[in-house]
């Protein structure tokens, strides 16, 4: 394990809480599912469903679990070693350049264009010009036909977990 996830909010926690399991760091770092104590002598387990860490680390706090927003469904819960995986609800998608919210998929393509790609949790429907086959980008003008979009199947995590 050597990659890092995108930083999440820190989970405020009492590092000496009695219910948290302790172990010794290995070579000065703590394993996934743990964080390091302030004196560097202990690894303290993250709290299931509250916080997590995905890699060997010297975090003083585990990372706070993401809560799925309204308009999202939870595909998998937060564990001590993996963040929550959230996905946009059917008929909505999350763009790379605006990952903070799910946007409604278009219901159809502009005049002179045909649909070649369905609405998925991470992309809008895809439209191409009938003649040239070039993709349409930007806002939709008048809609010629209404096409029911089908949701995609693969999961789209709220934040990458390496």
């Amino acid at each position: 394990e050597s990659a890092l996830i995108t930083q999440q909010d820190l989970a405020p926690q009492q590092r000496a809480a009695p219910q948290q399991k302790r172990s010794s760091p290995s070579e000065g770092l703590c394993p996934p599912g743990h964080h390091i104590s302030e004196d560097g002598r202990d690894c303290i387990s993250c709290k299931y469903g509250q916080d997590y860490s995905t890699h060997w680390n010297d975090l003083l706090f585990c990372l706070r679990c993401t809560r799925c927003d309204s308009g999202e469904v939870e595909l998998s819960p937060c564990t001590t070693t993996r963040n929550t995986v959230c996905q946009c609800e059917e008929g909505t998608f999350r763009e790379e350049d605006s990952p903070e919210m799910c946007r409604k998929c278009r219901t159809g393509c502009p005049r002179g264009m045909v649909k070649v790609g369905d609405c998925t949790p991470w992309s809008d429907i895809e439209c191409v010009h009938k003649e040239s086959g070039t993709k349409h980008s930007g806002e939709v003008p008048a809609v010629e036909e209404t096409v029911t979009s089908s949701p995609g199947t693969p999961a789209s995590p709220c934040s990458l977990s390496g």
Partner: antibody
Framework: EVQLVESGGGLVQPGGSLRLSCAAS????????MSWVRQAPGKGLEWVAT????????YYPDSVKGRFTISRDNAKNTLYLQMNSLRAEDTAVYYC????????????WGQGTLVTVSS | DIQMTQSPSSLSASVGDRVTITCKAS??????VAWYQQKPGKAPKLLIY???TRHTGVPSRFSGSGSGTDFTLTISSLQPEDFATYYC????????FGQGTKVEIK
């Protein structure tokens, strides 16, 4: 006296590779977690990579993940940073740094070595 | 990432002046903050860790305070060798630094 001396910097083209070294002395190198930190010209400091004392565990920020690899040779008291697929934004002075005892942060730094990525 | 916002970005002061530099974390980092001094072409030097603990050999005119999100580095009586750039750093979650404060001669 703790000493960290970096070497291996230079001019490299975008997409190219470079390997930095850091020779450590004055302390028991194999007992310490080590890191690389960089400083772009006129900019602030940015953490780049961390490796455990024995070299078994490493971690990186997303900005370099998959392109940079930190490693160490405890027999030679040397820390390395292998940098691949270099970009213009990787231009910086690269410092090797030691994590202190019981403080979980860097206590000693090297003088740095300049890496310039340009065509 | 946790952002560390340092202010001011630069300041002019005279020998003997009391200088205060502040750093604000974008979220609670407890007391996991360090302060470094850097002179041109030199390695950064650790001054303060755990927000208020002076590193070995650091003069007593340097002091740190704060917890949570607000932190301060104070130089009680500026000396000629103190003209440098100062950085705060949080180490609660990975490592992020402030943009630096350059202390110049007035």
């Amino acid at each position: 006296e703790v000493q960290l001396v970096e070497s291996g910097g230079g001019l490299v083209q975008p997409g190219g590779s470079l390997r930095l070294s850091c020779a450590a002395s004055g302390f028991t190198f194999s007992s310490y977690v080590m890191s690389w930190v960089r400083q772009a010209p006129g900019k602030g400091l940015e953490w780049v990579a961390t490796i455990s004392s024995g070299g078994s565990y490493t971690y990186y920020p997303d900005s370099v993940k998959g392109r940079f690899t930190i490693s160490r040779d405890n027999a030679k008291n040397t820390l390395y940073l292998q940098m691949n697929s270099l970009r213009a934004e990787d231009t910086a002075v690269y410092y090797c740094a030691r994590r202190g005892d019981s403080m979980i942060t860097t206590d000693y730094w090297g003088q740095g070595t300049l890496v310039t990525v340009s065509s | 990432d946790i952002q560390m916002t340092q202010s001011p970005s630069s300041l002019s002061a005279s020998v003997g002046d009391r200088v205060t530099i502040t750093c604000k974390a974008s979220q609670d980092v407890g007391t996991a903050v360090a302060w470094y001094q850097q002179k041109p072409g030199k390695a950064p030097k650790l001054l303060i860790y755990w927000a208020s603990t002076r590193h070995t050999g650091v003069p007593s005119r340097f002091s740190g305070s704060g917890s949570g999100t607000d932190f301060t580095l104070t130089i009680s009586s500026l000396q000629p060798e103190d003209f440098a750039t100062y950085y705060c750093q949080q180490y609660s979650s990975y490592r992020t630094f402030g943009q630096g404060t350059k202390v110049e001669i007035k």
